[in-house]
């Protein structure tokens, strides 16, 4: 957890992905209870979910969320307009595409409406919190007698994503994996025609448009080899 207390002089360490600050209180009370941490993820830059663990509250509390963008034209405080709920208690907020500004510092504030002094603010770099959709339309081309090429599509700008390809045969106990850059193409130079291969791919918003750590879900697997169609030996796009 990268955290720091924000100081009035503005000299916070802006290299951290987010910062946490709590309002000071004069006496020990409910106000001193820390608020849960807010976690935000931007899904394919289509919407963003900011969620917190509502069960960490000592009693069921409908915490409220406000947000704004620091030092920008979008610095007006906004109320959450679409809450997410867990057992009828607020546990998150969903923001739509037009409310997402990847390259401005996103400030999110959680507050206990019954104790307005009890609030916590975090600053997030949204370009580091993007999770793309899983790769789609995996296809295999046989380039030569022993060489396969795997291609896939992403529903996002190609150069913003890097990829991880995993493959194995039915004889393997574990996956072999290979990193692939924005060109979203993978070649396997030596294929054993007697074995059945399985391939899958996942993608990450890194490093050209952001520095996200989280990968997408895995694609549907695609298979090639002894048990696949013999109709067209040069093109296979069979999903499990």
């Amino acid at each position: 957890l990268n955290t720091t207390i924000l100081t009035p002089n503005g000299n916070e360490d802006t290299t951290a992905d987010f910062f946490l600050t709590t309002m000071p209180t004069d006496s020990l009370s409910v106000s001193t209870l820390p608020l849960p941490e807010v976690q935000c993820f931007v899904f394919n830059v289509e919407y963003m979910n900011c969620t917190w663990n509502s069960s960490s509250e000592p009693q069921p509390t409908n915490l409220t969320l406000h947000y704004w963008y620091k030092n920008s034209d979008n610095d007006k405080v906004q109320k959450c307009s679409h809450y997410l709920f867990s057992e009828e208690i607020t546990s998150g907020c969903q923001l739509q595409k037009k409310e997402i500004h990847l390259y401005q510092t996103f400030v999110v504030q959680l507050q206990d409406p019954r104790e307005p002094r009890r609030q916590a603010t975090q600053m997030l770099k949204l370009q580091n919190l993007v999770i793309p959709w899983a790769p789609e339309n995996l296809t295999l081309h046989k380039l030569s007698e022993s060489q396969l090429e795997l291609n896939w599509n992403n529903r996002f700008l190609n150069h913003c994503l890097e990829h991880l390809v995993q493959y194995r045969t039915d004889w393997d106990h574990s996956w072999t994996e290979q990193s692939v850059d924005y060109r979203h193409k993978f070649s396997l130079p030596s294929v054993d025609g007697q074995k059945r291969y399985t391939f899958r791919v996942r993608s990450r918003f890194n490093p050209l448009c952001g520095s996200a750590q989280h990968w997408s879900e895995w694609s549907h697997p695609i298979h090639w080899g002894s048990n696949t169609s013999k109709e067209n030996p040069f093109l296979f796009a069979l999903e499990a």
Partner: nanobody
């Protein structure tokens, strides 16, 4: 499948004009920042002009007053009108797409081969 297809390049005399077009598909065009880069032989990829989703534009100092960037959201197309062309404008021109807000708030150097094949512009004296 994300695709950017440039067209409109060609050979022209110094002082002439060309209009480059770039048609985009496979992503939300009107929610992206678009740009034009160029690369002359032996040179690095150079940012020429950008247009953000809010309509704001940027021009490299070397093309200010001569080049104009525009876009047509209905056609998913971005244009670069190039007037008063000079021999030093000779290069392969590449169309680029970035996440919304990239150019105004983030930046970072780009390689020209991140996008399409480009279109050749040759200006002779």
């Amino acid at each position: 499948q994300v695709q950017l297809q440039e067209s409109g390049g060609g050979s022209v005399q110094a002082g002439g004009s060309l209009r480059l077009s770039c048609t985009a598909s496979g992503f939300t065009f009107d929610d992206s920042d678009m740009g034009w880069y160029r690369q002359a032989p032996g040179n690095e990829c150079e940012l020429v002009s950008t247009i953000s989703s809010d309509g704001s534009t940027y021009y490299a100092d070397s093309v200010k007053g001569r080049f104009t960037i525009s876009q047509d959201n209905a056609k998913n197309t971005v244009y670069l009108q190039m007037n008063s062309l000079k021999p030093e404008d000779t290069a392969v021109y590449y169309c680029a797409a970035e996440p919304r807000g990239y150019y105004s708030n983030y930046g970072g150097r780009r390689e020209c081969n991140y996008w399409g094949q480009g279109t050749q512009v040759t200006v002779s004296s």
